[in-house]
C-alpha cells in the first residue's frame, strides 16, 4: 500500500471538481460483513488557507474533490491532506495516508504590455524588416499556454503592410513589414496591437493594448522614365 499520494487540480475551479482518488486495501471480507468495508475521511488540511475546508473525500470511493472556491496557485501551490481510512465502514481500525494536492496554474493573469508605447523607424521599400519587438509580462506559468502570448494588429494597418509573430522563447511580439512602405504615400503609421494568450482566460480579464508609431524613412530612389 502507498501512504503518500500526489494529485493536481487547476486553481480557481468550481466546488465539486474531482482532484484524485486514494485507495486503501483491506483483506477482510467486505461482502457478508463490514470488516473489509473501508470508509475514508479527511483528518486535516495544511495549510488552512484560505480556510480549513477546501477539499472533501467521498466516504466510500476515496475520491477527493474541491468543496470550496478560492484555490489560488500564487498563494498556496500545494496542500497536504491527512486521509484516514477506517474499516468496518468507519467503526473499526484506522490507518492514515497523506495526499499532496498540487494547484496548477490557470490562465487567470492577462499578458500586459510593458511598455505600452513604442516608436520605430523603418526605411521605405524594406520587406521583412524587423520594425519593433514588443514586450509583455504575464504572471502565469512560463512557457505554458497560459503564458504564451498571441499578438493581433487591431488597427492602423489599413494597407496590410505589417505582420506580428511571437518569439518562442522571449514571448516578445516581433513586428515586421509584410510589404514595402512608401514614404511619399504615407510617412507615418500608428499601429494598435492587442495581446492575449494561447489558452483562453478563465475569467473576464482586461486586454492590454500597445501603440506603435512607425516613422517611414525616405530612401533616395532612382528616377523613372
Amino acid at each position: 500500500t502507498q501512504d503518500t499520494f500526489r494529485g493536481s487540480v487547476l486553481e480557481g475551479v468550481l466546488p465539486g471538481t474531482s482532484v484524485m482518488q486514494v485507495t486503501a486495501t483491506d483483506e477482510d471480507d467486505a461482502i457478508y460483513t463490514y470488516n473489509g468495508v473501508v470508509a475514508y475521511s479527511i483528518h486535516s488540511q495544511e495549510p488552512k488557507d484560505p480556510h480549513d475546508l477546501m477539499f472533501t473525500i467521498h466516504r466510500s470511493t476515496g475520491t477527493i474533490s474541491v468543496i470550496s472556491s478560492g484555490l489560488d496557485r500564487e498563494k498556496v501551490p500545494e496542500y497536504t491532506l491527512t486521509i484516514q481510512a477506517t474499516d468496518m465502514d468507519g467503526d473499526g481500525s484506522t490507518t492514515t495516508a497523506v495526499a499532496v494536492v498540487e494547484i496548477l496554474d490557470a490562465n487567470d493573469n492577462a499578458p500586459m504590455f510593458d511598455p505600452q508605447k513604442y516608436e520605430a523607424h523603418v526605411p521605405e521599400n524594406a520587406v521583412g524588416h524587423e520594425v519593433q519587438r514588443l514586450t509583455v509580462t504575464d504572471l502565469d506559468a512560463p512557457n505554458s499556454p497560459a503564458w504564451r502570448a498571441t499578438y493581433l494588429i487591431m488597427g492602423g494597418d489599413d494597407g496590410d503592410h505589417f505582420t506580428i509573430t511571437t518569439h518562442p522563447e522571449s514571448n516578445q511580439g516581433i513586428l515586421t513589414t509584410r510589404k514595402g512602405l512608401d514614404f511619399e504615400a504615407k510617412n507615418q503609421h500608428t499601429l494598435y496591437v492587442e495581446v492575449t494568450n494561447e489558452a483562453p482566460f478563465v475569467l473576464k480579464l482586461p486586454t492590454s493594448t500597445a501603440t506603435i508609431v512607425v516613422h517611414v524613412e525616405d530612401v533616395n530612389e532612382a528616377p523613372v522614365f
Epitope: R6, P77, T80, V100
Partner: antibody
Framework: VQLLEESGPGLVTPSQSLSITCTVS????????INWVRQPPGKGLEWLGV???????NYNSALKSRLSITKDNSKSQVFLKMTSLQTDDTARYYC?????????????????WGQGTTVTVSS | ELVMTQSPSSLAVSVGEKVTMSCKSS????????????LAWYQQKPGQSPKLLIY???TRESGVPDRFTGSGSGTDFTLTISSVKAEDLAVYYC?????????FGGGTKLEIK
C-alpha cells in the same frame, strides 16, 4: 548575484521566543519561495517551513504550533518566529531560496542558502 | 513523514577514486504523472552552508562539475563522484520534496585519505 543573509539574537533563554530575519538581494520575494532549515551542532538538516510567493505557508507539522513565517516583499525580508524555545532548539538557522515557484522548476530543491545564524538556547 | 536513510555514514577515499553513496526513501518518490523523482542532493563543506548539487534525482544544478552524477528511481538513489578531488571533502545530504514535511537523510561524510 543572489544573496540571503540571516540575522538573529544569538542567545535565547528557555521558554522565550526566537525571531530571525532573512534579507535577500538579487531576486524578488514575489518570484521565489523561501524556506527555513535548521541544523543542530554536529547534526543533520531539518526543514522548518516555506513561505510561497503569494504569502501562503507550509510548515513542518512537528513544529507547526510554535512556528510562524511571514515576509515583507517591499523590504525583501522574510521573518521566522518560533515560540517556547527549549535547549534542543539550539541550532544554526538557515534561510534558503527555492529553485522556482512551479513544480516543474523543482521548487522543493533549494539553490541558494544564507550563511546561517547560530541560536543558542540556554539559561 | 517520509524517512530518508543514507549510507554509509562516512567513507574515506583517495584523490582520483570513484565514490558512490546511497540514499533510500521509506516510500517511492516517483510521481507517475510526470515521471519525476522528487529528490535532491546537497554538499556541505566544513563551516559552510549546504550547496545544491542535483535535483529531480539526476539533473545537475548549473555550475556543478560533471564528476557529480545522481541516479536512481522510486526508493533507491545514488550520488556518484567519478574522480574525487580534495575539495570534495564534505557531508552529502539527500532530501525528498515529494511530500511535506520535506526531509533530509542523515548525511554521508566524505573524508580524503
Amino acid at each position: 548575484v543572489q544573496l540571503l543573509e540571516e540575522s538573529g539574537p544569538g542567545l535565547v533563554t528557555p521558554s522565550q521566543s526566537l525571531s530571525i530575519t532573512c534579507t535577500v538581494s538579487g531576486f524578488s520575494l514575489t518570484s521565489y519561495p523561501i524556506n527555513w532549515v535548521r541544523q543542530p551542532p554536529g547534526k543533520g538538516l531539518e526543514w522548518l517551513g516555506v513561505i510561497w510567493t503569494g504569502g501562503g505557508t507550509n510548515y513542518n507539522s512537528a513544529l507547526k504550533s510554535r512556528l510562524s513565517i511571514t515576509k515583507d516583499n517591499s523590504k525583501s525580508q522574510v521573518f521566522l518566529k518560533m515560540t517556547s524555545l527549549q535547549t534542543d532548539d539550539t541550532a544554526r538557522y538557515y534561510c534558503a531560496k527555492s529553485r522556482g515557484v512551479y513544480d516543474f522548476d523543482g521548487r522543493g530543491a533549494m539553490d541558494y542558502w544564507g550563511q546561517g545564524t547560530t541560536v543558542t538556547v540556554s539559561s | 513523514e517520509l524517512v530518508m536513510t543514507q549510507s554509509p555514514s562516512s567513507l574515506a577515499v583517495s584523490v582520483g577514486e570513484k565514490v558512490t553513496m546511497s540514499c533510500k526513501s521509506s516510500q517511492s518518490l516517483l510521481y507517475s504523472s510526470n515521471q519525476k523523482n522528487y529528490l535532491a542532493w546537497y554538499q556541505q563543506k566544513p563551516g559552510q552552508s549546504p550547496k545544491l548539487l542535483i535535483y529531480w534525482a539526476s539533473t545537475r544544478e548549473s555550475g556543478v562539475p560533471d564528476r557529480f552524477t545522481g541516479s536512481g528511481s522510486g526508493t533507491d538513489f545514488t550520488l556518484t563522484i567519478s574522480s574525487v578531488k580534495a575539495e570534495d571533502l564534505a557531508v552529502y545530504y539527500c532530501q525528498q520534496y515529494y511530500s511535506y514535511p520535506y526531509t533530509f537523510g542523515g548525511g554521508t561524510k566524505l573524508e580524503i585519505k
